[in-house]
């Protein structure tokens, strides 16, 4: 009876349910390629429910394996303006801690406005994210766009 | 010992793990720009565990955060044909209740053939999914090629 | 408390999460279109969980709906390039047991030099899935841009 | 609602050229291809083409490549035909139509254009 | 080019009675859950008129006595009950690929 009782009093957090969903706030200064992140349900539908941004990068809190996905949409372009400022491309990886940097997911615009994908990785807690945007058009703002998250699967 | 039978015995239901993949059953009249949907095992690989259909737009069961998917391909469609037609879009959005309207997610085709996306948002029970297919070109039917889904995440 | 102490211990393959992310290991002969994948921590960040691989195709261990998602970018791929060698077609597919045979998901490359999807769908142990990748670009072995993968969603 | 007004009939001499208009109304302009068709008795109905008012691009029936320019101009909402080098085989009804949602069949026709070709 | 091929070239039908129009094409015009056949209707002295589209599907406007069916290479309107104002040339085309083409026309008379 007392595990029952424990079970129910558990935060949703313990059982493992990471998850956040972030909308684009701004682009870097001129030598940063990094997209900034903002997340909040005053923001819209945008959530952080474990996951926390740090500086506009998404540090995980939790070790797992994570679903990641992002969609990135081009403002104001077409595909003529998307292969006369060729090539855009949007990288996704750990950025911190050093000792653990990498790229998880790549993606290239070419004839393109919008790129989106997903994959399965492992994070450790301390892992942030980054997504470096490397081309000459900004990213849309609009929240059906652009947004980028994480979804905590299994240990 | 009582606990654990009736752990045992909670439909999947239950445990929140609302679930739908759908099948494009056809477009809409003429000012009509969504896209309706079916599903079941009886039309091939797809389903609704809990979300229902309303007149072909997906209504939501259960509040929570839901990872939602969609993939559309059009027809007899090459980038030539898809440049030489008026911009292709497609948006999914909350259409009802009214007051909860907002789009969700949103690509547009440029010169592809195919789009494909998803997002984590919260839903919540009794919100109305639209597609809404803006454009000239038709969408293909084929169940590999254009397919729409949700699946809940956590509360 | 004997029911609480053997939900505890538990393996995590029994509460029905299998997952599993590959990377690209080789594409087949001449008249052979499958991709063939592997998977490990000694490769990097692919792994498998519960699912297994079959001559570099992965075969299902658990019945269940499943999150099937896909990237897959042509190497030395530019718009020109896919232009000139289209069709290239990426299809997700059960090969085998020949009896439950059927594509599940099909994309084209069109002008674009990267595809990425996800679906859900119902999967029963012994299903092998087979990734048929027509044309004649090859695809990055870039564990950032090419990477298959499935995870459990629910029985 | 949709309506496409053709120009008057056309009188020519083997060798001309003609170009005939279609002025379309009731819609967005440049959010529907519009198609030309040819109708003779002795070939019946023939797709010559099909113009993309949004960026000018036409697409062409092979039969008619060498001798068909299909334009349209957005700030008249009128798209035009033209044809060179007739024969008396030109001497046919020219209709331009367009859909009501996908393209690929016609829903809105114009009155057609008549084109008689004669020394 | 997909050739289409509509018969009979010419029917008599009584008031009242069923018309059967059949068009063949050449090789299939289906493809992505579609059958890419459409049917007009064209009276003297006016453009062709839009009865069917996609094989099957009425348009906006047109009776329900008017039908089709088919897939594949071949296809059929059907007009029941056929009335006075259905005499007129039927014509058959297909948006399968470039360049669309269509059938030689049957003519249909009321008896």
């Known amino acids: 009876q007392r595990f029952a009782q424990a079970q129910q009093q558990l935060p949703l957090e313990s059982l493992g349910w990471d998850v956040a969903e972030l909308q684009l706030n701004h682009t870097g200064p001129q030598q940063d390629p990094r997209l900034y992140w903002q997340g909040g349900p005053a923001l819209g539908r945008s959530f952080l429910h474990g996951p926390e941004l740090d500086k506009g990068q998404l540090r995980i809190h939790r070790d797992g394996i994570y679903m990641v996905h992002i969609q990135v949409t081009l403002a104001i372009c077409s595909s003529t303006t998307a292969s006369r400022h060729h090539p855009t491309t949007l990288a996704v990886g750990i950025c911190s801690p050093a000792s653990r940097s990498i790229s998880l997911l790549r993606l290239s615009f070419h004839q393109g406005c919008t790129i989106a994908s997903q994959r399965l990785t492992p994070l450790a807690r301390g892992d942030t994210l980054c997504t470096n945007l490397t081309g000459t058009l900004l990213p849309s703002r609009n929240t059906d766009e652009t947004f980028f998250g994480v979804q905590w699967v299994r240990p | 010992q009582r606990f654990a039978q009736a752990q045992q015995q909670l439909p999947l239901e239950s445990l929140g793990w609302d679930v739908a993949e759908l099948q494009l059953n056809h477009t809409g009249p003429q000012q009509d720009p969504r896209l309706y949907w079916q599903g079941g095992p009886a039309l091939g690989r797809s389903f609704l565990h809990g979300p229902e259909l309303d007149k072909g737009q997906l209504r939501i069961h259960r509040d929570g955060i839901y990872m939602v998917h969609i993939q559309v391909t059009l027809a007899i469609c090459s980038s030539t044909t898809a440049s030489r037609h008026h911009p292709t879009t497609l948006a999914v959005g909350i259409c009802s209740p009214a007051s909860r309207s907002i789009s969700l997610l949103r690509l547009s085709f440029h010169q592809g053939c195919t789009i494909a996306s998803q997002r984590l948002t919260p839903l919540a029970r009794g919100d109305t999914l639209c597609t809404n297919l803006t454009g000239t070109l038709l969408p293909s039917r084929n169940t590999d090629e254009t397919f729409f889904g949700v699946q809940w995440v956590r509360p | 408390q004997r029911f609480a102490q053997a939900q505890q211990q538990l393996p995590l393959e029994s509460l029905g999460w299998d997952v599993a992310e590959l990377q690209l290991n080789h594409t087949g002969p001449q008249q052979d279109p499958r991709l063939y994948w592997q998977g490990g921590p000694a490769l990097g960040r692919s792994f498998l969980h519960g699912p297994e691989l079959d001559k570099g195709q992965l075969r299902i261990h658990r019945d269940g709906i499943y999150m099937v998602h896909i990237q897959v970018t042509l190497a030395i791929c530019s718009s020109t390039t896919a232009s000139r060698h289209h069709p290239t077609t990426l299809a997700v597919g059960i090969c085998s047991p020949a009896s439950r045979s059927i594509s599940l998901l099909r994309l084209s490359f069109h002008q674009g030099c990267t595809i990425a999807s996800q679906r859900l769908t119902p999967l029963a142990r012994g299903d092998t899935l087979c990734t048929n990748l027509t044309g004649t670009l090859l695809p990055s072995r870039n564990t950032d841009e090419t990477f298959f993968g499935v995870q459990w969603v629910r029985p | 609602q949709v309506q496409m007004q053709q120009s008057g009939a056309e009188l020519v001499k083997p060798g001309a050229s003609v170009m005939m208009s279609c002025k379309a109304s009731g819609y967005t302009f440049t959010t529907y291809n519009i198609h030309w068709i040819k109708q003779t008795p002795g070939q019946g109905l023939e797709w010559i083409g099909d113009i993309y008012p949004g960026n000018g691009d036409a697409s062409y029936n092979q039969k008619f490549r060498d001798r068909a320019t299909l334009t349209a101009d957005r700030s008249s909402s009128t798209a035009y035909l033209q044809l060179s080098s007739l024969t008396s085989e030109d001497s046919a009804i020219y209709y331009c139509?367009?859909?009501?949602?996908?393209?690929?069949?016609?829903?809105?026709w114009g009155q057609g254009t008549l084109v008689t070709v004669s020394a | 080019d997909i050739v289409m091929s509509q018969s009979p070239a010419s029917l008599a039908v009584s008031l009242g009675q069923r018309a059967t129009i059949s068009c063949r094409a050449s090789r299939s015009v289906s493809t992505s859950g579609y059958s890419y056949m459409h049917w007009y209707q064209q009276k003297p002295g006016q453009p062709p008129k839009l009865l069917i589209y996609?094989?099957?599907n009425l348009e906006s406007g047109v009776p329900a006595r008017f039908s089709g069916s088919g897939s594949g290479t071949n296809f059929t309107l059907n007009i029941h009950p056929v009335e006075e104002e259905d005499a007129a040339t039927y014509y058959c085309q297909h948006s399968r690929e470039l360049p669309y083409t269509f059938g030689g026309g049957t003519k249909l008379e009321i008896k």
């Open positions: 996609l094989a099957s």
């Open positions: 139509a367009t859909f009501s949602r996908f393209d690929g069949w016609f829903a809105y």
